[in-house]
């Protein structure tokens, strides 16, 4: 049961940071402007990844798209290059996961397969949010750093006696949005491969000892099992491992103590 | 028909108050943001201050600083410019304006009231 | 705060002539976001509150007789009147609409000779 909730929760956990780091990955609000001690402007400009927008005091917004590919900073091309590649792999994983759930059940697939899947999706949420946290990352490093060069320089003489107003930008939502979506994500894989190993099936140490009843022949196999993490050999009714090591004896003693599923 | 209304104006002695109004009709006035603007005599166009539609943004003149308060009251369609420590250079015609939608412009203007501080 | 400094501060032309005035802000009306300049042009005649003709340094209002166009950028903006008609007689203003406080122009002032 631990382990059904384990993989339930981390399934939606992942969802949701996904979710997240899609809905920063499109915000506009990645950087906006700085508004203290700044010259205070009749408009409020903030960008994205993939437009610039400003607000102007009626409220009338305006964006206009980086119509330019090769013109924009490898920085930022970078950063959109992590956030895209841990949206595709987190929805792959979200993919593989749907499948790999144990409340789910598709046709005759193996536990072995569903452990096996479970751990892939975990791996690739993992993968996927640590893409979105360095992506958000870069991006907020090159903001302090844009930040403390336009604080040095905060007019830029031009010609002498004409200043040009240098707009300096600060951490947007999305920045933060990113940040925790990521987090999400990460936690969310990092709890599937945790229900991976519950899922695993355990290697059986077969000890068979043959009872003898009237006229029938009965093999009972008492559990003799090993703490493994390996995907081994393919057992219908599986004990789940506690966490415990313990000997044969004390499993033989206290079945009660695990789960059946 | 959009129409801005003001009133209030007067002959006040120096160092003292008056308060100005602007009676708005023809668009939805919690909508806009709205300036005042003012124009000495023979002179230019000195703008004076400017409230947002919900009132989060107030800038003001420096040479009004401290001095007037621009308010406004959204349920009664009504801008006001409350304006205290009054000197012989706030004479003017005193112009409520509507913020435009676009390019931050001041679209509609009022017809104007005279303030005149005289001792 | 930013100076608005509008030249010439009269001129005299003929009816249908074309006419040009300046202005010139202290500092870039420029807003990178958006690639707009924050600079507005006011008609105001004799008697009568001022009235909207341009906006975004070159986007006329509507209503706006398409003889008057705005152009200009950064600091540097003009205002053209294509063909003088005696309604224009006015004193022309331009504003600073980017940052606070919003300034304007000493005015220009058309007359027809």
């Known amino acids: 049961m631990a382990v059904t909730a384990c993989q339930g929760l981390g399934f939606v956990v992942s969802l949701i940071g996904i979710a997240g780091i899609i809905a920063a990955t499109c915000m506009d609000q990645w950087s906006t402007q700085d508004l203290y001690n700044n010259p205070v402007t009749a408009v409020f400009n903030y960008q994205g990844l993939w437009r610039s927008c400003v607000r102007e005091s009626s409220g009338f917004t305006e964006c206009r798209g980086y119509f330019t590919l090769l013109g924009l900073p490898a920085m930022l091309q970078a950063v959109r290059a992590l956030m895209i590649v841990g949206i595709v792999l987190g929805a792959i994983g979200l993919l593989v996961s749907i499948f790999a759930l144990k409340c789910i059940r598709i046709g005759s697939m193996e536990d072995s397969a569903k452990a096996n899947m479970t751990l892939t999706s975990g791996i690739m949420f993992i993968v996927s949010g640590l893409c979105a946290i360095a992506g958000v990352s870069v991006f907020a490093n090159m903001l302090v750093t844009n930040f403390w060069m336009s604080t040095a320089n905060m007019y830029t003489g031009m010609g002498g006696m004409v200043q040009t107003v240098q707009t300096r930008y600060t951490f947007g939502a999305a920045l933060f949005v990113g940040w925790v979506a990521g987090g999400l994500t990460l936690i969310g894989g990092v709890m599937m491969c945790i229900a991976c190993r519950g899922l695993a099936p355990e290697e059986t140490n077969y000890k068979a000892v043959s009872y003898h009843a009237s006229g029938h022949s009965v093999a009972y196999k008492p559990g003799g099992f090993k703490a493994s993490t390996g995907f081994g050999s393919n057992t219908k009714n599986k004990k789940i491992y506690d966490g415990g090591a313990r000997t044969e004896d004390e499993v033989q003693s206290y079945p009660s103590k695990h789960d059946y599923v | 028909e959009v129409q801005l209304v003001e009133s209030g104006g007067g002959l006040v002695q120096p160092g003292g108050s008056l308060r100005l109004s602007c009676a708005v009709s023809?668009?939805?006035?919690?909508?806009?943001?709205m300036h005042w603007v003012r124009q000495a005599p023979g002179k230019g166009l000195e703008w004076v201050a400017y409230?947002?539609?919900?009132?989060?943004?107030?800038y003001y003149a420096d040479s009004v600083k401290g001095r007037f308060t621009v308010s406004r009251d959204n349920a009664k369609n009504s801008l006001y410019l409350q304006m205290n420590s009054l000197r012989a250079e706030d004479t003017a015609v005193y112009y409520c304006?509507?913020?435009?939608?676009?390019?931050?412009?001041?679209?509609?203007w009022g017809q104007g009231t005279l303030v005149t501080v005289s001792s | 705060d930013i100076v608005m400094t509008q030249s010439p501060d009269s001129l005299a032309v003929s009816l249908g002539e074309r006419v040009t005035m300046n202005c010139k802000s202290s500092?870039?009306?420029?807003?990178?976001?958006?690639?707009?300049?924050?600079l507005t042009w006011y008609q105001q005649k004799p008697g009568q509150p001022p009235k909207l003709l341009i906006y975004?340094?070159?986007t006329r209002e509507s209503g706006v007789p398409d003889r008057f166009s705005g152009s200009g950028s950064g600091t540097d903006f003009t205002l053209t009147i294509s063909s003088v008609q005696a309604e224009d007689v006015a004193v022309y203003y331009c504003?600073?609409?980017?940052?606070?406080?919003?300034?304007f122009g000493q005015g220009t002032k058309l007359e027809i000779k």
């Open positions: 304006v509507r913020s435009g939608y676009y390019g931050n412009s001041l679209d509609y």
């Open positions: 023809g668009f939805t006035f919690s909508s806009f943001g």
């Open positions: 409230i947002s539609s919900g009132t989060t943004n107030i």
């Open positions: 500092q870039s009306l420029f807003n990178s976001g958006n690639q707009r300049n924050y």
């Open positions: 975004w340094a070159s």
């Open positions: 504003q600073n609409v980017y940052i606070y406080p919003l300034t």
